[in-house]
Interface confidence: medium
């Protein structure tokens, strides 16, 4: 039977009442145009929304626009349109809210074709109150806030100016021209790279790459011959032109530019591109695309240096179009990674880390799931999970994947069971355990959200009819009760929930359509009297992450540790409330094989904890190049995996002498360049 | 200890060409905004031109657009001004100094250029 | 272009007396506002930056201040080798620089 249709399915009591008393709905005065909603603050309760309406006329196009704000989870909206002096506000930089609990927002206006530069509204108390800022320039991008310190702004310009704020947007300096991308590193430091040729385009390959630590007073340039540049985690990279050619690599640097080395990655050519797809303190996942138009590449994952580099996944899916990749970050479980992989004969198939990329499996086929018909053996087959791709690509999937750090080992997907992922409308999946064992959730594709830290389920089905339920579970997903929210069914157009899946609010957004008019409208159900008691300690359960064989002793073991979770049982329909914290137990394991990625010029054979030599480099030294000179590299083929905390048991030799040579780790003076690097 | 030791400036007619030299020392020279300043004899200071620390951006006085080019090598820790078309108010000591914050903060020591028939 | 104005031209005082020399920038130039020192037959010594910041080695008798259009150098307490000739000199919104005519502070 389908899920939440079993016997065993007990239904939460008088939930239509409780929700009933607990649903506020709010209808817009508004012509439908387009919406946006932002979050100010955290547990603040304050939802600013923005709608937009644009009238084309023959000569112009008339807009109008009207803001409005909740400071009680989106129940009830106030109009405060007058707050900026009724000003349209321009979408594309949508609402600029500061970082944390600063309670700051900044709104760009619409202005005339001749003025001398843009507006602002800007707002330091949560919305209440707005300040209007004529601005000394026309804004290219949205107003970006210092992570450290959210009265330091900056902005580009129409001009190519960097523009920087230090209080709050209230004076604006140029502190650069020509500038063709600016990021805020830590400490209120500012990356950027400028042109020297007329523009950004026409310089790409011949960028230099600046730095000022004191908000423009004072300027290094750090690099020449930039591409472009990113930051991940405590990494700075950049994409830097080769002397002799066409070909671009990656340096990378750890102390904010001051020393580069170059990346023990493949170089690329005009038409590839490299990506970082994730980064932490410890590592980098770095995505670095095949020649030709292949939609394909390899991932690598670094030292802890993000120098050497190990190949990680091959045939990675990332399309050069569009740029989309389906790679996901389970956030719900530590080392857990979702991507797709495009095989020999053109069809996608997910593939899962649970070691932070040290070895790629298939999802493990859901119990309750039939393999589809692009599995070759009806037995034998995997899930396979709808992302960005496939979103891109216009199939019926409304929703990425799912998952939230405080709701422990939830992960909820769309997906598909056969050989590949499939065109037909997918189902719905969850897993409760990070991702090792997979469960049909809900059949045809959905909206859905988690609140109350995994407490609650909330989904909406995705149709192109007008919808008036909802479902929602309390029980990991097991089991669906549904509640009908409005007697007039409504266009859904989005769920929205406050980021940090703590709340106990859903808003469902739709609009109504009536002969003449159409308004949007919003309903906010709020879900406090369905978990009507806290949960107390009998509520929890211990939970060992990555358990894969209770026999062994080192089941759980991942990346040199393990952890105990307290988790909600499922059969508890309490609130784990706004306050709750993951409780957890880490435990260190011994040293194994698995803990050790493969080194440099090494590499592991699928299903093999094994490292061996490349073919390519068998015979030959290995040598590679950090902070300008050139190291040999002694090895049997491991090196521990970065932030991998195992003790005693397997280890493996690994010596790195210096040669004594120069080498091309230095970009700043790349006439030097004579690498012997692989 | 930062240095810099500017060279080339001599006796020239109008109309002549000069390159001055300034070579740099006890810092990373690659990292750092560089100018020139020049000085008429008896008169105030003068900005002449400025580059950025990877050779890509340059900017001049009006006075000299067209006419002057700095350059640097980074591999050899040197600044340039190659100077075309020199006319008697070009007449100066030229010095070399490293950019900070909103000034410079080392100077050399300055080569006198003069032009004259 | 951004022209800055400084007075007085010449500023005779004795030593340990206070002297007070002024800068005015026809624009705003914020706080990118530098003060040097030059003495004859040598190169201008930086004093102060980013119109309050003393630079490397500077004796605590100098001070800058102001911001916008406005700047001041102040020496505290004149000591004998502090009589030279004060440039202030300014960075718009990019490379670009001015340098003032100069103020000569002399002994009376």
């Known amino acids: 039977s389908a899920p939440g249709e079993d016997e065993e399915c007990g239904r939460v009591r008088d939930f239509v009442a409780k929700l009933a008393n607990n649903t506020h709905q709010h209808v817009f005065d508004d012509l439908r145009g387009s919406v946006s909603l932002s979050w100010v603050g955290d547990s603040t309760g304050v939802i600013l929304v923005l709608t937009t309406f644009h009238v084309p006329l023959v000569i112009m196009t008339f807009g109008q626009s009207k803001l409005y704000r909740s400071e009680d989870y989106g129940k009830n909206f106030k109009d405060i349109t007058d707050l900026i002096n009724n000003t349209f506000i321009r979408t594309e930089f949508g609402m600029a809210i500061g970082p944390e609990n600063s309670g700051k927002v900044v709104l760009t206006a619409e202005v005339s074709g001749g003025s001398r530069g843009g507006r602002i509204f800007r707002s330091s108390d949560f919305a209440k109150n707005f300040v209007q800022t004529d601005l000394p320039f026309h804004p290219l991008t949205q107003m970006m806030y210092s992570p450290q310190n959210s009265d330091y702004l900056l902005a580009l310009s129409t001009e190519n100016g960097l523009w920087v704020s230090k209080n709050f947007g209230g004076k604006w300096e140029e502190i650069h021209k020509a500038v063709c991308l600016a990021k805020w590193g830590s400490d209120n430091t500012i990356f950027f790279t400028t042109y020297a040729n007329g523009s950004c385009k026409a310089d790409l390959g011949a960028l230099e790459l600046w730095r000022t630590s004191d908000l423009g007073k004072s300027f290094k340039t750090i690099g020449v011959k930039i591409y472009s540049f990113g930051l991940g985690g405590r990494f700075l990279f950049a994409s830097v032109m080769a002397d002799k050619d066409t070909t671009r690599r990656i340096h990378v640097s750890t102390d904010q530019g001051d020393t580069w080395s170059m990346a023990q990655l493949p170089s690329v050519g005009q038409e590839q591109f490299y990506s970082i797809l994730a980064a932490n303190d410890d590592m980098v996942f770095m995505h670095v695309d095949e020649p030709g138009d292949t939609g394909f590449g390899t991932i690598f994952t670094s030292d802890d240096r993000g120098i050497v580099y190990s190949k990680s996944l091959d045939r990675h899916l990332y399309t050069t179009t569009g740029g989309e990749t389906d790679f996901t970050n389970v956030t719900s479980l530590r080392g857990v990674y979702i991507t797709s992989v495009l095989s020999e004969d053109n069809s996608i198939q997910t593939m899962i880390t649970f070691d932070q990329g040290g070895r790629w499996t298939h999802l493990r086929k859901p119990e309750n799931s039939e393999c589809d018909a692009t599995a070759k053996n009806k037995n034998e087959c995997s899930l396979h999970i709808h992302a960005s791709y496939s979103i891109s690509q216009k199939l019926n999937v409304p929703m990425a994947p799912l998952s939230e750090p405080n709701a422990v080992g939830i992960v909820i997907a769309h997906g598909s069971v056969g050989d590949a992922i499939s065109v037909m409308v997918p189902d719905v999946y969850i897993s409760d355990d990070g991702g090792y064992s997979w469960t049909k959730m809900l059949e045809g594709p959905h909206y859905y959200t988690i609140l109350d830290s995994g407490g609650i389920i909330v989904a909406i089905e995705h149709s192109s009819r007008p919808i008036n339920v909802i479902k929602f579970s309390t029980d990991e997903g097991q089991c669906w009760q549904t509640y009908t929210f409005t007697r007039d069914p409504i266009y859904f157009t989005g769920l929205a929930s406050e980021p940090g899946a703590r709340s106990m609010n859903i808003s469902i957004w739709g609009f109504t359509e009536s002969f003449l008019t159409s308004q949007w409208v919003s309903y906010t159900i709020d879900f406090k009297d369905i978990l009507e008691r806290n949960c107390e300690e009998k509520d929890y359960t211990i939970w060992l992450a990555h358990s894969t064989d209770p026999e062994d002793y080192e089941d759980g073991c991942i990346l040199g540790y393990k952890e105990q979770f307290l988790r909600l049982r499922k059969s508890s329909v309490c609130q784990n409330g706004r306050d709750y914290v993951v409780t957890k137990q880490p435990s260190i394991c011994l040293c194994s094989l698995e803990d050790f990625l493969c080194d440099f010029g090494y590499y592991r054979p699928e299903n093999d904890s094994k490292c061996v030599e490349q073919p390519e480099l068998k015979g030959h030294d290995l040598e590679f190049c950090l902070y300008g000179r050139e190291e040999h590299l002694t090895t049997n083929g491991y090196r521990k995996i970065p932030g991998d905390k195992c003790q005693g048991g397997v280890n493996p030799v690994r010596e790195v002498k210096d040669l004594k040579k120069k080498c091309t780790s230095n970009f700043l003076s790349p006439e030097k360049q004579n690498s012997k690097s692989n | 200890e930062v240095q810099l030791l500017e060279s080339g400036g001599g006796l020239v007619q109008p109309g002549g060409s000069l390159r001055l030299s300034c070579e740099a020392s006890?810092?990373?020279?690659?990292?750092?905004?560089m100018s020139w300043v020049r000085q008429a004899p008896g008169k105030g200071l003068e900005w002449v031109s400025t580059?950025?620390?990877?050779?890509?951006?340059?900017n001049y006085t009006d006075s000299v657009k067209g006419r002057f080019t700095i350059s640097r090598d980074n591999s050899k820790n040197t600044l340039y001004l190659q100077m075309n078309s020199l006319r008697a108010e070009d007449t100066a000591v030229y010095y070399c100094?490293?950019?900070w914050g909103s000034g410079f903060d080392y100077w050399g020591q300055g080569t006198l250029v003069t032009v004259s028939s | 272009e951004i022209v800055l104005t400084q007075s007085p031209a010449t500023l005779s005082l004795s030593p340990g007396e206070r002297a007070t020399l002024s800068c005015r920038a026809s624009q705003s130039v914020s706080s990118y506002l530098a003060w040097y020192q030059q003495k004859p037959g040598q190169a201008p010594r930086l004093l102060i930056y980013d119109a309050s910041n003393r630079a490397t080695g500077i004796p605590a008798r100098f001070s800058g201040s102001g911001s916008g259009t406005d700047f001041t150098l102040t020496i505290s307490s004149l000591e004998p080798e502090d009589f030279a000739v004060y440039y202030c000199q300014q960075r718009s919104n990019w490379l670009i620089f001015t340098f003032g005519p100069g103020t000569k502070v002399d002994i009376k």
């Open positions: 006890g810092f990373t020279f690659r990292s750092y905004v």
């Open positions: 100094a490293k950019n």
């Open positions: 580059i950025s620390g990877g050779g890509g951006n340059t």
